[in-house]
């Protein structure tokens, strides 16, 4: 429960948050557990601690390992733990079980696709989708806000979805993709 | 100091009503969920009822679903139990409790209690 | 709902000597257990959170330990004022539950 996995791609944008949640005004500190070392805060290093979240901007695979929080309130401390595992870019466009995320159903009536993680970033439209490596078009697919509608669902739109949408950090931007299956039922 | 503070406990026949009352000092009573022990004579302790900070959701122990409720005044900083339709077996000293932690969807542990309120419920 | 079992319901034991108090979940609930102590006449008092942490102000010999279903209360060298009721709490969901006691008393 206060383990997470969290995983990216090399020269992307990762950003995690500390699966040990606390209000808004609790302090955050994190570390990197093999070594203790404290996570900065400065916004001018690659990877640094921004109070629930730790951000890898852009990650490398080399920043994989485990990562602790400990949420401080004025009278108790709670730590959480976030197993980071950045991965090499594919050359192909097969993408890996272990770079997906959990499967969606839809049917005729109700076929959103989310995009998942998006809310941990800054990011502004427009959202970029992928079916199977192909960008989508036609008037079936609409982006909205955070997810995909598409319209008369068919058993033939099974298959992988991915989005892709920049995050802004200080005025620099960093690409991020995610990936997953989305799986048609009948009514 | 943090101090919590239960009233309007006492006698009351099976069927009757009561309502209980705690007040907060000490801390910012708003961002903090409130929760409802109690203690049969003798016995162990038993959760009844949690109420959220500023959002306000209720949560109850099947045993006084439908029959307590459970409620807040953030403007008096005082939290409520409205106990209706008693039974003997809701006689016990009943204790508010303070949660420190808990955000939206999860729980933690109780770090302040009161000294407590005795309902007896008899004829 | 989570059901917590506490043994033994009595621990007979004298000043100096080390405590182990056992509680046990029907199912997993990670660390979010607490511990409490209870003495005649009082409210409960907070020991020990997520399993393993003391709470503020709680002297050292207090400690807790355990993950899952299988959590223990150690009580290192037990002074004339740990002798109460000691209380485990599970919150890692609604209904918020509590063992049923084990009482420290003295030998």
């Known amino acids: 429960k206060f383990s997470k996995q969290s995983w990216g791609l090399e020269n992307e944008a990762l950003i995690v948050r500390c699966p040990r949640q606390g209000k808004p005004s609790y302090t955050v500190d994190w570390y990197y557990s093999q070594t203790n070392k404290s996570i900065p805060t400065q916004k001018r290093n690659r990877v640094f601690a921004s109070g629930q979240l730790l951000k890898f901007l852009p990650a490398a695979v080399a920043d994989s390992g485990i990562y602790t929080c400990i949420v401080r309130s004025p009278t108790f401390n709670r730590t959480g733990y976030a197993n980071v595992t950045i991965y090499k870019k594919q050359s192909d466009c097969n993408v890996p079980d272990y770079l997906m995320y959990s499967t969606v159903s839809g049917s005729e009536k109700n076929s959103k696709i989310y995009c998942p993680t998006i809310d941990l970033y800054n990011w502004t439209a427009p959202l970029e989708w992928f079916k199977n490596c192909q960008a989508l078009q036609g008037s079936r697919y609409r982006a909205h806000k955070s997810f995909l509608v598409i319209d008369n669902v068919m058993t033939e739109d099974a298959g992988d979805y991915t989005c892709k949408f920049i995050h802004n950090e200080n005025g620099a931007n960093y690409s991020v993709t995610a990936t997953r299956s989305f799986t048609v039922k009948d009514e | 100091e943090v101090q919590l503070l239960e009233s309007g406990g006492g006698l009351v026949q099976p069927g009757g009503s009561l309502r209980l009352s705690c007040a907060a000092s000490?801390?910012?009573?708003?961002?903090?969920?409130m929760i409802w022990v109690r203690q049969a004579p003798g016995k162990g302790l038993e959760w009844v009822s949690s109420?959220?900070?500023?959002?306000?959701?209720?949560y109850y122990a099947d045993s006084v679903k439908g029959r307590f409720t459970i409620s807040r005044d953030n403007s008096k900083n005082t939290l409520y139990l409205q106990m209706n339709s008693l039974r003997a077996e809701d006689t016990a000293v009943y204790y508010c409790?303070?949660?420190?932690?808990?955000?939206?969807?999860?729980?933690?542990?109780?770090?302040?209690w009161g000294q407590g309120t005795l309902v007896t419920v008899s004829s | 709902e989570i059901v917590l079992t506490q043994s033994p319901a009595t621990l007979s034991l004298s000043p100096g000597e080390r405590a182990t108090l056992s509680c046990r979940a029907s199912?997993?609930?990670?660390?979010?257990l607490a511990w409490y102590q209870q003495k005649p006449g009082q409210a409960p008092r907070l020991l020990i959170y997520?399993?393993?942490n003391r709470a503020t102000g709680i002297p050292a010999r207090f400690s807790g330990s355990g993950s899952g279903t299988d959590f223990t209360l150690t009580i290192s060298s037990l002074e004339p004022e740990d002798f109460a009721v000691y209380y485990c709490?599970?919150?890692?969901?609604?209904?918020?539950?509590f063992g049923q006691g084990t009482k420290v008393e003295i030998k």
């Open positions: 409790a303070r949660d420190p932690w808990s955000t939206e969807g999860s729980f933690f542990v109780l770090d302040y």
């Open positions: 199912q997993s609930v990670d660390d979010d």
């Open positions: 997520d399993a393993s």
């Open positions: 109420i959220r900070g500023e959002g306000g959701g209720t």
């Open positions: 000490g801390f910012t009573f708003s961002i903090y969920d």
């Open positions: 709490q599970q919150y890692i969901t609604a209904p918020l539950t």
